[in-house]
């Protein structure tokens, strides 16, 4: 276990901060698995990746926090990023 | 509706340069398309950090930059040869989700001929 | 890299015909697929993206589905200005991949 929430927070340290800006605007409208909620828009706002992290996996686990997260930096243009993610998850 | 404005013709020589402008925002793809044949991708360019991602194939004679003060985006395309004869497309991913090209040019018309 | 394979390479049709495209991906893409409409001498443009979302003005009788790796583009009631060339798209890896498009024609 925390193989995924390394990868993640992998993940989003190596984000601009303009990047992880990006990155939670589009949090709070990527398409979600049915049963599952998303995370309150104020709770986004000052997180940093580390806190961002917790709350992917608190949220939505570790196996689907990794999938969305991939999703999200795929929606950002971040395919290699994503890839990486997913790959580090999958070892 | 936004419009992605690039030149429309350009007449190079074998071995010559080229370079493509397209006024866009945003992350800006380079496709290329030969007459009756269908598209292929030559990499992007984020306008606001840079950031940049080639296909491999043409990784070697396509140099994408960004000039951000007038939000256009370049292609030098370089060594040219016949089989690069094609129409050059840039086209934009404004859509928040999925990265699909939502906006496209007109395409520049490059011919390579002596 | 992602080899998107289109079939069939053209169709002959009447208008008002119900058409199926195909399109698949040589590996799992998600749902990261999209479908360009494409017309002599014109730029493409986006009709499907994510599989199976409409984008902006294109009429409902465009329809989009699939995921993973087998992917469609339905059109219900093909009309003349339908006629055009179709072409996938993936934007799950890079490189981006096109399939190579299907022709629609008139019978």
């Known amino acids: 276990m925390g193989r995924a929430r390394d990868a993640i927070l992998d993940a989003l340290e190596n984000l601009t901060a303009e990047e992880l800006k990006k990155f939670k605007l589009k949090l709070l409208s990527v398409p979600l698995r049915e049963g599952y909620g998303r995370i309150p828009r104020g709770a986004l706002a000052a997180m940093d990746a580390l806190d961002l992290t917790d709350k992917l996996v608190s949220f939505y686990l570790e196996t689907y926090g990794a999938e969305l997260t991939a999703n999200v930096l795929r929606d950002m243009g971040l395919q290699e990023m994503a890839g990486q993610l997913q790959a580090a998850t999958h070892q | 509706q936004v419009q992605l404005q690039q030149p429309g013709t350009e007449l190079v020589k074998p071995g010559a340069s080229v370079k493509l402008s397209c006024r866009a925002s945003?992350?800006?793809?380079?496709?290329?398309?030969?007459?009756?044949?269908?598209l292929e991708w030559i990499g992007n360019i984020n306008l606001s950090n840079g950031r940049t991602n080639y296909n491999?194939?043409f990784r070697a004679m396509a140099t994408l930059t960004v000039d951000k003060s007038s939000s256009t985006a370049y292609t030098q395309l370089s060594s040219l040869t016949s089989e690069d004869s094609a129409v050059y497309y840039c086209?934009?991913?404004?859509?928040?989700?999925?990265?699909?090209?939502?906006?496209w040019g007109q395409g520049t018309s490059v011919t390579v001929s002596s | 890299n992602i080899v998107m394979t289109q079939y069939p390479k053209s169709m002959s049709l009447s208008i008002g015909e119900r058409v199926t495209l195909r399109c698949k991906a040589s590996?799992?893409?998600?749902?990261?697929v999209s479908w360009y409409q494409q017309k002599p001498e014109q730029s493409p443009k986006l009709l499907i993206y994510?599989?199976?979302n409409r984008y902006t003005g294109v009429p409902d009788r465009f329809t989009g589905s699939g995921s993973a790796t087998d992917f469609i583009l339905t059109i219900t009631s093909v009309q003349a200005e339908d006629l055009a060339d179709y072409h996938c798209?993936?934007?799950?890896?890079?490189?981006?991949?096109f399939g190579a498009g299907t022709k629609l024609e008139l019978k």
């Open positions: 086209a934009n991913s404004m859509v928040p989700h999925f990265f699909p090209m939502d906006y």
């Open positions: 945003g992350w800006t793809h380079w496709v290329k398309q030969r007459p009756g044949q269908g």
């Open positions: 491999e194939k």
């Open positions: 590996e799992n893409v998600g749902s990261y």
């Open positions: 994510g599989a199976s």
């Open positions: 798209g993936q934007s799950y890896n890079y490189p981006l991949t």
